[in-house]
């Protein structure tokens, strides 16, 4: 008789999840010599230990502490790029501007990027059928708690000028319910962070509006100012040209506004 299994609203664990995490760990240590001390088998064991045999709606930040310790990494605190709802461009940017880092350029972010995972209470099985959805099921699920934990730590580490890339095509350019709005903004340390600089990325080619005047950006400015951090905002009207100019800053067309 097949055992009854909880049906969640979200997609199940990514297929070949253990193999993917291990392979990504090895690949990351290959690319980043400073992380070659990392024991990928222990990393997988710590990752697994955070959610296996636990109710997938009852995961805590504490569950991820062994993994956080193994993944401890020093990134230049003044070279941090946060993003909200515009991951691909943020990643394209740091692939070109190699001295800047998104969360997914760190080991832990790289391991988990685009993956889903969850277990089941009291069994050592990984649930490949379904996992809790943040809205429809519960917020304290393995994936959400992981990203909340690593995002908090990443924001806490930031210093000097912190950049954030925001999607100007969305109705809420700054969304208080996003990871950036609910976690990262509130964990920037005023004693270390001087300025948060927002880059608002325009979607339409003919869009010449100043999206820095958007009400949600004003809301972000208010939150940041109340935390004694300065705020600045830039419109990126042509993201394609913006990337091109990051690659070739001496190009004559790069002196004009992008």
């Amino acid at each position: 008789v097949p055992r009854w299994r909880q049906q969640w609203s979200g997609p199940g664990t990514t297929k070949r999840f253990p193999e993917t995490v291990l392979a990504r760990c090895v690949k990351y240590t290959e690319i980043h010599p400073e992380m070659r001390h990392v024991d990928c088998q222990s990393v997988w064991d710590a990752f697994k230990g955070a959610f296996i045999s636990k109710h997938p709606c009852n995961i805590t930040e504490e569950d991820y502490q062994p993994l956080m310790k193994l993944g401890t990494q020093t990134v230049p605190c003044n070279k941090i790029l946060l993003w909200s709802r515009i991951k691909d461009l943020a990643h394209q940017f740091t692939q070109v501007q190699r001295d800047m880092f998104t969360l997914e350029d760190t080991l832990l972010g790289y391991l988990a990027d685009d993956l889903t995972w969850c277990g089941e209470f009291n069994t050592s099985k990984i649930n490949y059928q379904s996992c809790p959805d943040w809205r429809k099921d519960c917020s304290n699920n393995p994936v959400s708690v992981f990203w909340k934990t690593v995002s908090r730590r990443f924001a806490e580490a930031a210093c000097d000028v912190v950049h954030v890339m925001l999607n100007g095509s969305r109705s809420k350019i700054f969304d208080k319910n996003s990871t950036f709005g609910s976690v990262e903004v509130h964990n920037l340390q005023p004693e270390k962070v001087q300025t948060l600089e927002a880059w608002v990325i325009h979607g339409g080619r003919e869009d010449s509006r100043d999206l820095c005047q958007d009400p949600t950006i004003k809301e972000l400015e208010s939150i940041i100012s109340k935390r004694n951090i300065q705020f600045s905002c830039k419109n990126i009207y042509r993201p394609d040209k913006f990337l091109q100019c990051v690659k070739n800053p001496e190009d004559s067309s790069c002196t004009s506004e992008i």
Epitope: L22, C25, V26, T29, E30, P33, R36, H37, V38, D39, C40, Q41, S42, D45, A46, P66, K69, L70
Partner: antibody, heavy 121, light 107 residues
Framework: QVTLKESGPTLVKPTQTLTLTCTFS??????????VGWIRQPPGKALEWLAH???????RYNPALKSRLTITKDTSKNQVVLTMTNMDPVDTATYYC?????????????WGQGTLVTVSS | DIQMTQSPSSLSASVGDRVTITCQAS??????VAWYQQKPGKAPKLLIY???YRYTGVPSRFSGSGSGTDFTFTISSLQPEDIATYYC?????????FGQGTKLEIK
Amino acid sequence: QVTLKESGPTLVKPTQTLTLTCTFSGLSLSTSGKGVGWIRQPPGKALEWLAHIWWDDDKRYNPALKSRLTITKDTSKNQVVLTMTNMDPVDTATYYCARIELGRSYVMDYWGQGTLVTVSS
Amino acid sequence: DIQMTQSPSSLSASVGDRVTITCQASQDVITSVAWYQQKPGKAPKLLIYSASYRYTGVPSRFSGSGSGTDFTFTISSLQPEDIATYYCQQHYTIPLTFGQGTKLEIK
């Protein structure tokens, strides 16, 4: 089949520089993810890690000995060389070279037979 | 540096006995501990890595467990060929450090 073999002088005088060579087969340091390191063991004592070198020339040294150690590789000859300056009688030990692999961090899975180096005047 | 304290330093057991060696790290190393076997005049051989993973070709009578600072190496049924010195090693951070060894003898 991975094999490693250490070679070098069996006797060195105090203050001299020791040069040891690890020659290996079944392993290429032009292959991503591979590395070779050195470990020593004084007679009747425990093992002590000295240094490692990775395929891409990334090097790691024991901080306590770093000022005296240099590790290099010659990929075409399948060799890794360790030099240790200002030798002292307390450096008398069997010196081993061993393989490391990415993912298992610094676990030594293949070892050479070792070469005994005595430091004496 | 992380100190690895191994105990006992020597032990005597009979063929077929269950043998346990412990290793304590001076700070949390999660599960990054390896165990090696060294026979007289020979190089060490890797038996266990990442606290509990048997290396390729290692007999199933050898096992490892533990996490944090306390680790255990077990031979479930001692064989005559297991007479050797056993070392633990932390592979969590540089400098890599080894325990002082446990010399195992047959009664």
